[in-house]
Interface confidence: low
C-alpha cells in the first residue's frame, strides 16, 4: 500500500501479512496485507486492528476489526463507546456510510481515525497529536511502527521511477514494466491517467499513485482509494500547506 | 513471544500471596514490577502481538489500581496534560480528564497535530 | 463478532480416547488462552486446563495429567482438546472457552459445549 | 468436593436484591484478585458476568455488582429480574489450579 508518515514522507511499500501500523502507549493499530494478484510484489490492506488501551476513568479496552466487506461500526464487543467508565463517550464510533466508511474519535487522546472499505481493500487514515504519537515506553520494539519510521528500504517500491518509465511507454501495454506480470485488464497509460485525472486533478503523489495503482491492478476502485485517501488529508491534516506532497527523492527509513 | 508465560508467571505470584487491598502492596507492586520486566524481555519478540499490548496496559492498570510506585522502570510514562490516576477525585469530577483538548489548553496552546494514511497499493 | 464453534457430540466406550474441536473466529487467536471446562450431567463446572495458542503453552488440572492433551493449530485458529483412557465418570458437557487477555484470568467468550457420553 | 463454597440455592421476588456468597481459602479467595463470576441458564454455555471481583464485561446489566472480604466473594444481583433466574458459578485462579464454586442456583420467586 501506499503510506503517508507522520513526518509527510510519501512511501509505497510492498510489507505483506500483518504489522504495526500504530504502536504506542495508548493506541496499538496492525494492518494485514496480501498481494494485489499472484505474483505481484504490490499489496493492500484486507484486514486492520485497532486496540484502545485501558485509559484512567476515560475507557475500557476496546478492539475495533475491519476485514475485507466487514467494516463494522462497532468494537468487537459489540459497544460502540470506551465502555461503562466515567468518560466513556470520549472514545465513538460513528458509521458515516454503511460498510464504507467509519470515523472513530478518542477525544480522551486527541486522536480521529478514518477507516474506509474502497473496492476490495481497506484504507486508514489518523490525527494523532505529537505527544500521542511519541507516547512510546520501548524504542526499540514499539518504535518501529510504519507511521512513524516508515517501511524498511527493503520493502519499498519505487513507484515514482515506475511512473516516469511508464510515461515514456506511451499508450503500450506496461505488463512487463509492472509489478505484476500476469495483471489482467491492466490500462493503457494515457487511460489510467485520463481516470485519475478525473478524481485527482493536482499532479501530486496521490495523483501518481492512482496512476500506479491502476497501471498495476487494472482496479479503478484504487482511483477512488487515491482520492478518499487525499480528502481525509484534507479533513485531518493541520497543515493545509502540506495538502499535497509532490515528487522527491525517496526517503530513507527512520 | 513469551507473552503467555509472563501471565502466567504472574498469576502464580499473585495467586497465593496478597490481597489487592491489603498492607501487601509492596509485595503485589513488587510481583507486577516483576511482571513488567517480563514483558519488556520479550518485546523485541512480541511487537505486533495484541496479547503484549493488552498485556502492558493491564499492568498500567494494576500499577495505579495498587498505588505502586510509578518512578521505577517499570512504570508507564502518561501524558503530561492528563492528570495521574491516583487522582481519584480530580479524575470521578472532571470531564476534562477524558476531552484532551480540554486539558492541553490548560498546560499551553494548540496541540500540535501529525496525520499518518494508508492506501491502495 | 467473536465466536467458538465446537464439534458434535460423541459416544465413546470406556478406556478410547475422545478429540474435540473448537474453532475460533472473530479475533486474533493468537492473543488468548483458551480454557477447558467440563460439566457432567446435572453437576457443576469443572475446569481442565488451557493452552496458550501463541507458544503452546500448557496448564493442566492436577486431577487431570497424563490422561490430558490440550493442542492448538494456528494456521486454522482451531483448539483441540483429547481426553484418553475415558471412564463413564467423564461423561459430560465439554467447553472450550477463550481467556481473556492481559493480566486477568477469565473466560469471557465460551463454546456452545460438546457432549461426550461414555458407555459401554 | 469444590474448594470454593457456595450456598446451593438463594431465591427473591423481582426487584428484591440477592447476595450469593463464594468462600475459600485466604490462597484461593482471600488473596487472590482473579475472582470471576458466570451465569447459566439450563442447556446453554456458561456467561460471564463478572471479572476481577468487580469488574463489569460491557453487554451485562449494572444491576450485577462484586465485592470481597476476607476470603469470601459475593455477587449481588440488585432489582431482581426474572430472566435473572439460573445457575451462578464463582471462579478463582489459585496458583497451579483454577477452582469453580460448587454453583448456586438463583430462584425468581
Known amino acids: 500500500p501506499h503510506l503517508r508518515t507522520f513526518t509527510d514522507r510519501f512511501q509505497t511499500c510492498k510489507v505483506q501479512g500483518a504489522w504495526p501500523l500504530i504502536d504506542n502507549n495508548y493506541l496499538n493499530v496492525q494492518v494485514t496485507n496480501t498481494p494485489v494478484l499472484p505474483g505481484s510484489a504490490a499489496t493492500a490492506t484486507s484486514k486492520l486492528t485497532i486496540i484502545f488501551k485501558n485509559f484512567q476513568e476515560c475507557v475500557d479496552q476496546k478492539v475495533y476489526q475491519a476485514e475485507m466487506d466487514e467494516l463494522p461500526a462497532a468494537f468487537v464487543d459489540g459497544s460502540k463507546n470506551g465502555g461503562d467508565k466515567h468518560g466513556a463517550n470520549s472514545l465513538k464510533i460513528t458509521e458515516k456510510v454503511s460498510g464504507q466508511h467509519v470515523e472513530i474519535q478518542a477525544k480522551y487522546i486527541g486522536t480521529t481515525i478514518v477507516v474506509r472499505q474502497v473496492g476490495r481493500y481497506l484504507t486508514f487514515a489518523v490525527r494523532m497529536p505529537e505527544e500521542v504519537v511519541n507516547a512510546v515506553e520501548d524504542w526499540d520494539s514499539q518504535g518501529l511502527y510504519l507511521c512513524l519510521r516508515g517501511c524498511p528500504l527493503n520493502q519499498q517500491i519505487d513507484f515514482q521511477a515506475f511512473h516516469t518509465n511508464a510515461e515514456g511507454t506511451g499508450a503500450r501495454r506496461l505488463a512487463a514494466a509492472s509489478p505484476a506480470p500476469t495483471a489482467p485488464e491492466t490500462f493503457p497509460y494515457e487511460t489510467a491517467v485520463a481516470k485519475c485525472k478525473e478524481k485527482l486533478p493536482v499532479e501530486d503523489l496521490y495523483y501518481q499513485a492512482c496512476v500506479f495503482d491502476l497501471l498495476t491492478t487494472g482496479d479503478v476502485n484504487f482511483t477512488l482509494a487515491a482520492y478518499y485517501a487525499l480528502e481525509d488529508v484534507k479533513m485531518l491534516h493541520s497543515n493545509k500547506d502540506k495538502l499535497h506532497l509532490y515528487e522527491r527523492t525517496r526517503d530513507l527509513p527512520g | 513471544c513469551k507473552i503467555l508465560k509472563c501471565n502466567s508467571e504472574f498469576w502464580s505470584a499473585t495467586s497465593g500471596s496478597h490481597a489487592p487491598a491489603s498492607d501487601d502492596t509492596p509485595e503485589f507492586c513488587a510481583a507486577l514490577r516483576s511482571y513488567a520486566l517480563c514483558t519488556r524481555r520479550t518485546a523485541r519478540t512480541c511487537r505486533g502481538d495484541l496479547a503484549y499490548h493488552s498485556a502492558v496496559h493491564g499492568i498500567e492498570d494494576l500499577m495505579s489500581q495498587h498505588n505502586c510506585s510509578k518512578d521505577g522502570p517499570t512504570s508507564q510514562p502518561r501524558l503530561r496534560t492528563l492528570p495521574p490516576a491516583g487522582d481519584s477525585q480530580e479524575r470521578s469530577d472532571s470531564p476534562e480528564i477524558c476531552h484532551y483538548e480540554k486539558s492541553f489548553h490548560k498546560h499551553s496552546a494548540t496541540p500540535n497535530y501529525t496525520h499518518c494514511g494508508l492506501f491502495g497499493d | 463478532e467473536v465466536q467458538l464453534v465446537q464439534s458434535g457430540a460423541e459416544v465413546k466406550k470406556p478406556g478410547a480416547s475422545v478429540k474435540v474441536s473448537c474453532k475460533a473466529s472473530g479475533y486474533t487467536f493468537t492473543s488468548h488462552g483458551i480454557s477447558w471446562v467440563r460439566q457432567a450431567p446435572g453437576q457443576g463446572l469443572d475446569w481442565m486446563g488451557w493452552i496458550s495458542p501463541y507458544s503452546g503453552n500448557t496448564n493442566y488440572a492436577q486431577k487431570l495429567q497424563g490422561r490430558v492433551t490440550m493442542t492448538t493449530d494456528t494456521s486454522t485458529s482451531t483448539a483441540y482438546m483429547e481426553l484418553s483412557s475415558l471412564r463413564s465418570e467423564d461423561t459430560a458437557v465439554y467447553y472450550c472457552?477463550?481467556?481473556?487477555?492481559?493480566?486477568?484470568?477469565?473466560?469471557?467468550?465460551w463454546g456452545q459445549g460438546t457432549l461426550v457420553t461414555v458407555s459401554s | 468436593q469444590s474448594a470454593l463454597t457456595q450456598p446451593r440455592s438463594v431465591s427473591g421476588s423481582p426487584g428484591q436484591s440477592v447476595t450469593i456468597s463464594c468462600t475459600g481459602t485466604?490462597?484461593?479467595?482471600?488473596?487472590?484478585?482473579?475472582v470471576s463470576w458466570y451465569q447459566q441458564h439450563p442447556g446453554k454455555a456458561p456467561k460471564l458476568m463478572l471479572y476481577d471481583v468487580t469488574k463489569r464485561p460491557s453487554g451485562v446489566p449494572d444491576r450485577f455488582s462484586g465485592s470481597k472480604s476476607g476470603n469470601t466473594a459475593s455477587l449481588t444481583i440488585s432489582g431482581l429480574q426474572a430472566e435473572d433466574e439460573a445457575d451462578y458459578y464463582c471462579l478463582s485462579y489459585a496458583g497451579t489450579d483454577t477452582l469453580f464454586g460448587g454453583g448456586t442456583k438463583v430462584t425468581v420467586l
Open positions: 472457552a477463550r481467556v481473556g487477555s492481559g493480566p486477568y484470568y477469565y473466560m469471557d467468550v
Open positions: 485466604s490462597s484461593s479467595v482471600g488473596d487472590s484478585i482473579y
